[in-house]
Amino acid sequence: TLNSVLNSNAIKNLPPPLGGAAGHPGSAVSAAPGILYPGGNKYQTIDNYQPYPCAEDEECGTDEYCASPTRGGDAGVQICLACRKRRKRCMRHAMCCPGNYCKNGICVSSDQNHFRGEIEETITESFGNDHSTLDGYSRRTTLSSKMYHTKGQEGSVCLRSSDCASGLCCARHFWSKICKPVLKEGQVCTKHRRKGSHGLEIFQRCYCGEGLSCRIQKDHHQASNSSRLHTCQRH
């Protein structure tokens, strides 16, 4: 399966050079540190770009987010970009590296207020991509600091999927995000065909579980594009 992370023919992407920021050349794609060639033990260092197309943050790694590589670039292409470190500008939580969240347009540490027992956070969801403004829909939410120590259970408020327990993902629910179950075989899933369409969901579904992919249900192949039902199916 794709879960064999230590496969000898896998290559891992690294973040762009320090100081790289979304929307500027040099941060558009990630550099690869090296390749372990199959059947051999030669580790060859390379320094090139590895764009990984995406439509939403969940398709990228936990240390990445999905966005257009340049502000003035092709609006139809989004790729995985390295997450933003503390004190860097942001427009949504997924842009900030794990352990941080987006507050007032800046990535701040999730740990800042642990000693106080809870943190206050403004969840700002703008229903578009990185080019949209920060007005969106804002509401004040109190998050227990415990969520940063123990994985959130179903229904717990979260910032990203890594905040949730195994078998759960962090998905939008109204204008907050909560831990929801990863989809099982046969369950209805959402297939994002149009760029940015995932931003319109106020009840977002998780992705399909391992070994499953979101495909058109066989008896719905003849249906019109708008009414096609997608379900999680075995590869």
Epitope: N3, I11, L212
Partner: nanobody, 122 residues
Framework: EVQLVESGGGLVQPGGSLRLSCAAS????????MGWFRQAPGKEREFVAA??????YYADSVKGRFTISADNSKNTAYLQMNSLKPEDTAVYYC?????????????????WGQGTLVTVSS
């Protein structure tokens, strides 16, 4: 484990065309990206193009000449290469995206095929 098998490589004259194919198994084909990379003799492996349902992406050196596509029903990715130049000579590798955070990875990454040789020469 992902299995990738490339085909379609060969010898072609400058200005000619080739179409590479990559058959994938064990890959969530219609969800995660497929890509093509190349490695010329004595050089580092470089990105050529990638495609997913959200769109395609090309290296500047091949824009307008190469087209990447995928046929989900056949679990196959293609690289149509037109107006080939001698500097396009390389081993071309198919690559499959692994699904990122859905599988717990900190970085989205690719897994590789064994490669197919493309030689552009008169």
């Amino acid at each position: 484990e992902v299995q990738l098998v490339e085909s379609g490589g060969g010898l072609v004259q400058p200005g000619g065309s080739l179409r590479l194919s990559c058959a994938a198994s064990g890959h969530t084909f219609n969800t995660y990206p497929m890509g093509w990379f190349r490695q010329a003799p004595g050089k580092e492996r470089e990105f050529v193009a990638a495609v997913s349902y959200s769109g395609s992406y090309y290296a500047d050196s091949v824009k307008g000449r190469f087209t990447i596509s995928a046929d989900n029903s056949k679990n196959t990715a293609y690289l149509q290469m037109n107006s080939l130049k001698p500097e396009d000579t390389a081993v071309y590798y198919c690559a499959a995206g692994n699904g990122g955070r859905a599988y717990g990875y900190s970085r989205a990454r690719y897994e590789w095929g064994q490669g197919t040789l493309v030689t552009v020469s008169s």
